[in-house]
């Protein structure tokens, strides 16, 4: 949070996570000012000379932008007057992780706030029944994770059971040599039960559920960013 008081305005940021290779947003809001031409937004990154992005006098000024951010950043220009200084970041890289500062100056005053940006890879798991196995098994796959996550299985019927002895998890490096595909197989499953495959690293936690009955298979998956 920025410092409130005379000549200072409140600036608020939120810790967030970026998914490598996807587009991300660094969130920052401030006390609105209807005088767009008097608003200056500067995004800085700790350890980087030059700016990540600058918006002033109602338009971008990228003359001081660091090379690593060239062609990758934009503010939501039409939302600046309502106090949105968030930064759109294209093609998130592992090296984009770090501490960013959102600095704001308006006719009301100035303020700044820091933001911790974590980068990694996370994706939804998909669980399928593996009919090829000698005994009925479940196969949980998630295409992109980094850093290497932990994988755990749970079941509604056998709550608290440890499935590590009856499951096998593998990690396959993807073509860009950073992220990995996660595959986990759970053996000896029983019908009329709901199984969950949980994948987690320090950035995200994803869960895939599957309910197998005689007549149907129901699936559900969800993904939650941690510490965001």
């Amino acid at each position: 949070f920025g410092i409130s008081g005379k000549h200072f305005i409140t600036v608020t940021t939120f810790t967030s996570a970026g998914n490598i290779g996807e587009d991300g947003t660094l969130s920052c809001t401030f006390e609105p000012d209807i005088k767009l031409n008097g608003i200056v937004i500067q995004w800085l990154k700790e350890g980087i000379k030059g700016l990540v992005h600058e918006f002033k006098e109602g338009k971008d000024d990228l003359s001081q932008q660091h090379e690593m951010f060239r062609g990758r950043t934009a503010v939501f220009a039409d939302q600046v007057v309502v106090g949105n200084a968030s930064l759109r970041l294209k093609n998130v890289q592992l090296t984009d992780a770090g501490t960013y500062t959102c600095y704001i100056r308006t006719s009301k005053g100035k303020g700044n706030a820091n933001l911790e940006y974590k980068t990694g890879a996370f994706s939804m798991p998909e669980i399928n029944v593996d009919y090829n196995a000698s005994s009925e098994s479940l196969r949980c796959e998630a295409p992109r994770w980094f850093p290497q996550p932990t994988v755990a299985w749970a079941s509604q019927v056998d709550q608290g059971a440890n499935f590590s002895e009856v499951s096998n998890t593998s990690f396959e490096l993807n073509s860009e040599n950073v992220t990995m595909k996660v595959v986990s197989v759970l053996y000896n499953v029983t019908i009329n039960n709901t199984y969950s495959c949980m994948i987690e690293n320090d950035i995200a936690k994803a869960t895939g559920d599957i309910k197998v009955t005689d007549s149907e298979v129901k699936r559900r998956s969800q993904l939650q960013l941690l510490n965001s």
Partner: antibody
């Protein structure tokens, strides 16, 4: 509205340097949210991005052409320029200048293009 | 660099019919993709950016969709002025690259 116009010699000899200038009218080259780019199209073929320049003079070139490309800008004349050295017949193309979004990085509008033939 | 592949190379369509053009990226480009129209002797014209955002002034019959590696440009009902070559362009990472183009011709 914003218009771009390429100018320069239509014929260049092999091993020499191709030089083109793009004049921007109807708007300022100092537009903060835009780069200024060059794209080329060999006869009957597809499009190749050559590189871009910001009004402050910072540049980014296509690695495949980087060793031969130089771009510059003259804000007082509202112009930016392309130089391509050591040309061969493979550099024969229609050369376009265009305004490039800083992000999203679309090209719009484009100049009408100028054909440069490399031949002795 | 990211290689963009367009298919088909040529598409023969009757006026009033729907045209579906495909563009595939060699790796994910998220939604960082633009579509252009080029007529003979003219410069390309921007139609779509961010995979699906139509440029102001471009008719609603043009629509873009897709994300990741698979993209589509759809022209819902072809007009005579729509017969041209269409290019996709990725701006996900440098160097920006274009597809080889799809020529939409009168059937």
């Amino acid at each position: 509205q914003l218009q771009l116009q390429e100018s320069g010699p239509g014929l260049v000899k092999p091993s020499e340097t191709l030089s083109l200038t793009c004049t921007v009218s109807g708007g300022s080259i100092k537009s903060g949210s835009h780069y200024w780019g060059w794209i080329r199209q060999p006869p009957g073929k597809g499009l190749e991005w050559i590189g871009n320049i910001y009004y402050s003079g910072s540049t980014y070139y296509n690695p495949s052409l980087k060793s031969r490309v130089t771009m510059s800008v003259d804000t007082s004349k509202n112009q930016f320029s392309l130089k391509l050295s050591s040309v061969t017949a493979a550099d024969t193309a229609v050369y376009y200048c265009a305004r490039e979004g800083s992000y999203p990085n679309w090209f719009d509008p484009w100049g009408q293009g100028t054909l440069v033939t490399v031949s002795s | 660099e990211i290689v963009m592949t367009q298919s088909p190379a040529t598409l023969s369509v009757s006026p009033g019919e729907r045209a579906t053009l495909s563009c595939r990226a060699s790796q994910s480009v998220s939604t960082n993709l633009a579509w252009y129209q080029q007529k003979p002797g003219q410069a390309p014209r921007l139609l779509i950016y961010d995979a699906s955002a139509r440029v102001t002034g471009i008719p609603a019959r043009f629509s873009g969709s897709g994300s990741g590696t698979e993209f589509t440009l759809t022209i819902s009902s072809l007009q005579s002025e729509d017969f041209a070559v269409y290019y996709c362009q990725q701006y996900h990472s440098f160097p920006f690259t274009f597809g080889g183009g799809t020529k939409v011709e009168i059937k």
